[in-house]
């Protein structure tokens, strides 16, 4: 025997109390799949969240963050404060990168400057709080057509998010 609820499309629910008829989801709710016995409550983008996509009868609302904040977590479950380049977010707010570290983004953590001497290269440009060191070529690398600079270390995502 086929479940009569399987005929209820997305945007409806199968009413337990009314002989399993398909009824539309009420306002501020949705069902993204067919055959559901309940409608889910629409997400509300309040406070530091703003609406990127309105809720419909078949799909949840999607939020992003107001200016000065960026999304964290699956589906932008949290908004984290932006900092300036050359800073990182700590529990006490945005703090400048310590000497020897940099952050070239508005989010994430300060990362150590590239150590040119480990690669046997001279420093071509000193690092700052907002920019990595630029390493020059190895003396032996100075041949025609060779690149004269080493690209900075690739940016990596932070491994933590401040509370």
């Amino acid at each position: 025997l086929q479940d009569p609820c399987s005929n209820c499309p997305a945007g409806t629910f199968c009413d337990n109390n009314r002989n399993q008829i398909c009824s539309p989801c009420p306002p501020n709710s949705f069902s993204s799949a067919g055959g559901q016995r309940t409608c889910d409550i629409c997400r509300q983008c309040k406070g530091v969240f703003r609406t990127r996509k309105e809720c419909s009868s078949t799909s949840n609302a999607e939020c992003d963050c107001t200016p000065g904040f960026h999304c964290l977590g699956a589906g932008c479950s949290m908004c984290e404060q932006d900092c300036k380049q050359g800073q990182e977010l700590t529990k006490k707010g945005c703090k400048d990168c310590c000497f020897g570290t940099f952050n070239d983004q508005k989010r994430g953590i300060c990362r150590p400057w590239t150590n040119c001497s480990l690669a046997g290269k001279p420093v071509l440009m000193n690092g700052t709080k907002a920019r990595d060191v630029v390493c020059g070529p190895r003396p032996a690398d100075l041949s025609p057509g060779a690149s004269s600079v080493t690209p900075p270390a690739p940016a990596r995502e932070p491994g933590h998010s401040p509370q």
Epitope: S23, P27, N28, R37, T38, D40, I41, Q44
Partner: antibody, heavy 122, light 112 residues
Framework: QSVEESGGRLVTPGTPLTLTCTVS????????MTWVRQAPGKGLEYIGI??????TYYASWAKGRFTISKTSSTTLELKITSPTTEDTAIYFC??????????????????WGPGTLVTVSS | AAVLTQTPSPVSAAVGGTVTISCQAS????????LSWFQKKPGQPPKLLIY???SLASGVPSRFKGSGSGTQFTLTISDLESDDAATYYC????????????FGGGTEVVVK
């Protein structure tokens, strides 16, 4: 159709605790389920709900402190992530009957389980 | 978040009398009607009395009557019996994915 909670016990602050709500006579996929608590000498306090499809919604004060999950079609769990002494209470699980046919949680909480006592003390 | 204020507490009446408990919401509940009333006795789980503001739950005597809409709701218990001594709570449903439900603070009914 019935609901029963279990897992309440004495725990020390910071020790995670998981409560279980076992239902019979219906499937969790057919209804919203809610968790409510009552601290000694206090009133009823809404913690959160789970929809038939498994989506969870929490009271603002409970976000991050509690996690509701479904482990089977008849078993619901409430995890108290890091209990404090303020979490000492009787914890109740209840079905939302949605007798008016709205299609989502309406507050028609029935039936209820007898409750399970959680005591947080050092 | 919305707040539900119940008054008065405690309220007392004689057997056979009538008590009226009010529940005032700071914001309108969903559909102006999604408000429930529960009876709570010590050592027992809450019992659903009224749902959707005025609908009587199954097995509940008609002595219990719910009324109201929007932000103002009332539970009236007539022909009071000694077994009605309990604390009564209202709960409202709100259009929010947080604080979807809010309970009132409760009203104790004393039967003399």
């Amino acid at each position: 159709q019935s609901v029963e909670e279990s897992g309440g016990r004495l725990v020390t602050p910071g020790t995670p605790l998981t409560l279980t709500c076992t239902v019979s006579g219906f499937s969790l996929s057919d209804y919203y389920m809610t968790w409510v608590r009552q601290a000694p000498g206090k009133g009823l306090e809404y913690i959160g709900i789970m929809s038939g499809s498994g989506s969870t919604y929490y009271a603002s004060w409970a976000k991050g402190r509690f996690t509701i999950s479904k482990t089977s079609s008849t078993t619901l769990e409430l995890k108290i992530t890091s209990p404090t002494t303020e979490d000492t209470a009787i914890y109740f699980c209840a079905r939302d009957g949605d007798y008016a046919g709205w299609g989502y949680a309406t507050g028609a909480f029935d039936p209820w389980g007898p409750g399970t006592l959680v005591t947080v003390s050092s | 978040a919305a707040v539900l204020t119940q008054t008065p507490s405690p309220v007392s009446a004689a057997v056979g009398g009538t008590v009226t408990i009010s529940c005032q919401a700071s914001q309108s509940v969903v559909g102006n009607s999604l408000l429930s009333w529960f009876q709570k006795k010590p050592g027992q789980p809450p019992k659903l009395l009224i749902y959707s503001a005025s609908s009587l739950a199954s097995g509940v005597p008609s002595r219990f009557k719910g009324s109201g809409s929007g932000t103002q709701f009332t539970l009236t218990i007539s022909d009071l019996e000694s077994d009605d001594a309990a604390t009564y709570y209202c709960t409202g449903r709100y259009n929010s994915d947080t604080d979807t439900f809010v309970f009132g603070g409760g009203t104790e009914v004393v039967v003399k």
